[in-house]
Interface confidence: low
């Protein structure tokens, strides 16, 4: 990997757990300033394998809101919008990081944790076995 | 919102920046022990709206390795497996905490940050602007 | 050594016809998604038509129905017949490597559609 | 169709200087953008795809940034060859469009 030398400005940790407990600025930067909220506010409605969106609330976790997608077909809609069962909708799921209250109800210590999400839908063509 | 009240075996804090800055442990719960970290390796490929995906590397970011989707076509694949231009391949995109090493290069002090990633690629209907 | 080489263009009338050729060398053409692109008298670039390594085409409004893309993948050449020429398409053709941009082109072709 | 405007159409910088060339699409395109350069009498040539990705083969000098709906070509430490018309493309949204051109020149 890279070394890259230790800042001298650095916080000090007299933590016993230390490197596994570290300090979180949770006032977040935004690099996505400039970005359209509703950029692909419509894609849901939009695609060949439309999805609807869940809300998944959680007061113990940061961010307390997260949206799951969920696959409104099991196939997908063709030219003529009619569900084509030959192809199938598919979650494209992804892990991202999110900060549990640990211990819980505590609202100044969190644990990192992974969660799968899934974030909308693909049309695949289905693997068909072939039975010998 | 939901008011909980606060655990009294919560750690203490005297940071002036509290509640803005909060302990988090490292130690990684994962929710996903029982998926297949094989669960959509071949979407990308079988997908009508396929993607290649390229590696964002950052040291100074955590995780330091991110995986970016980008759409292969601008139409998408049909049933004959030639690109239809008809229909858009457009990614799906997902804002997602990272953590940031703030100051720079420091082991044990992080800021939280939001970035913008694409997940995946889903083939929609293209938005057709009738001139009037 | 990426090579694209255009031909074909001229002086035509309006109402007319021009078949451009663009001959590509330095890469496994059939591989690749190609584009014609073209910079008017003004400097004004425009895409004209792309062509994926699959075979279907994509036209902006401003040429649809009046240009159309072909290659030959053994021959290694991308082609553009253009109908029904109008004074406004006279520029100069390029042959770019590429669909969503053009990551190599070509020297180009001037076309002049003048009465 | 998404109007790429490139503000300025001349700019005269010094050698060795630093320039920012900037384009501003009508709507968002998340990145999607391309800056090309072309010296009298040549094809454009590619610089920059995905609005920072160096193309293989073009100097470190030049780089890009920018989200949403504006983006920046800077070139540090201007050079002689550097002399030429560049373009922003965007390929987000179909048709592809150009910026109309912001013409590189010294002082």
């Known amino acids: 990997g890279i070394t890259i030398p230790r800042n001298p400005g650095c916080p000090n940790s007299e933590d016993k757990n230390f490197p596994r407990t570290v300090m979180v600025n949770l006032n977040i930067h935004n690099r996505n300033t400039n970005t359209n909220p509703k950029r692909s506010s419509d894609y849901y409605n939009r695609s060949t394998s439309p999805w609807n969106l869940h809300r998944n609330e959680d007061p113990e976790r940061y961010p307390s809101v997260i949206w799951e997608a969920k696959c409104r077909h099991l196939g997908c809609i063709n030219a003529d919008g009619n569900v084509d069962y030959h192809m199938n909708s598919v979650p494209i799921q992804q892990e991202i990081l999110v900060l549990r209250r640990e211990p819980p109800h505590c609202p100044n210590s969190f644990r990192l944790e992974k969660i799968l999400v899934s974030v909308g839908c693909t049309c695949v063509t289905p693997i068909v076995h072939h039975v010998a | 919102g939901i008011t909980i009240p606060r655990n009294p075996g919560c750690p203490n804090s005297e940071d002036k920046n509290f509640p803005r800055t909060v302990m988090v442990n490292l130690n990684i719960h994962n929710r996903n022990t029982n998926t297949n970290p094989k669960r959509s390796s071949d979407y990308y490929n079988r997908s009508t709206s396929p993607w290649n995906l390229h590696r964002n590397e950052d040291p100074e970011r955590y995780p330091s390795v991110i995986w970016e989707a980008k759409c292969r076509h601008l139409g998408c694949i049909n049933a004959d497996g030639n690109v239809d231009y008809h229909m858009n391949s457009v990614p799906i995109q997902q804002e997602i905490l990272v953590l940031r090493r703030e100051p720079p290069h420091c082991p044990n002090s992080f800021r939280l940050e939001k970035i913008l990633v694409s997940v995946g690629c889903t083939c929609v209907t293209p938005i057709v602007h009738h001139v009037a | 050594e990426v090579k694209l080489v255009e031909s074909g263009g001229g002086l035509v009338r309006p109402g007319g016809t021009l078949k451009l050729s663009c001959a590509a060398s330095?890469?496994?053409?059939?591989?690749?998604?190609m584009s014609w692109g073209r910079q008017t008298p003004e400097k004004r670039l425009e895409w004209v038509a792309f062509m994926s390594s699959g075979g279907s085409t994509y036209y902006p409004d401003s040429v649809k129905g009046r240009f159309t893309i072909s290659r030959d993948n053994v021959r290694n050449i991308l082609y553009l017949q253009m109908i029904s020429l109008r004074s406004e398409d006279t520029a100069m053709y390029y042959c770019?490597?590429?669909?969503?941009?053009?990551?190599?082109w070509g020297q180009g072709t001037l076309v002049t559609v003048s009465a | 169709d998404i109007q790429m405007t490139q503000s300025s159409s001349y700019l005269s910088v010094s050698l060795g200087g630093r320039v920012t060339i900037t384009c501003k699409a009508s709507?968002?395109?998340?990145?999607?953008l391309a800056w090309y350069q072309q010296k009298p009498g040549n094809a454009p040539r590619l610089l920059i795809s995905?609005?920072?990705s160096l193309e293989t083969g073009v100097p470190s000098r030049f780089s890009g940034s920018g989200s949403g709906k504006d983006y920046t070509l800077s070139i540090t430490s201007l050079q002689t060859e550097d002399v030429a018309t560049y373009y922003c493309?965007?390929?987000?949204?179909?048709?592809?469009?150009f910026g109309s051109g912001t013409k590189l020149e010294i002082k």
């Open positions: 995905g609005a920072t």
């Open positions: 709507d968002h395109i998340n990145n999607w």
């Open positions: 330095g890469f496994t053409f059939s591989s690749f998604d």
């Open positions: 493309q965007q390929y987000w949204s179909t048709p592809f469009t």
């Open positions: 770019a490597r590429g669909e969503r941009y053009g990551s190599y």
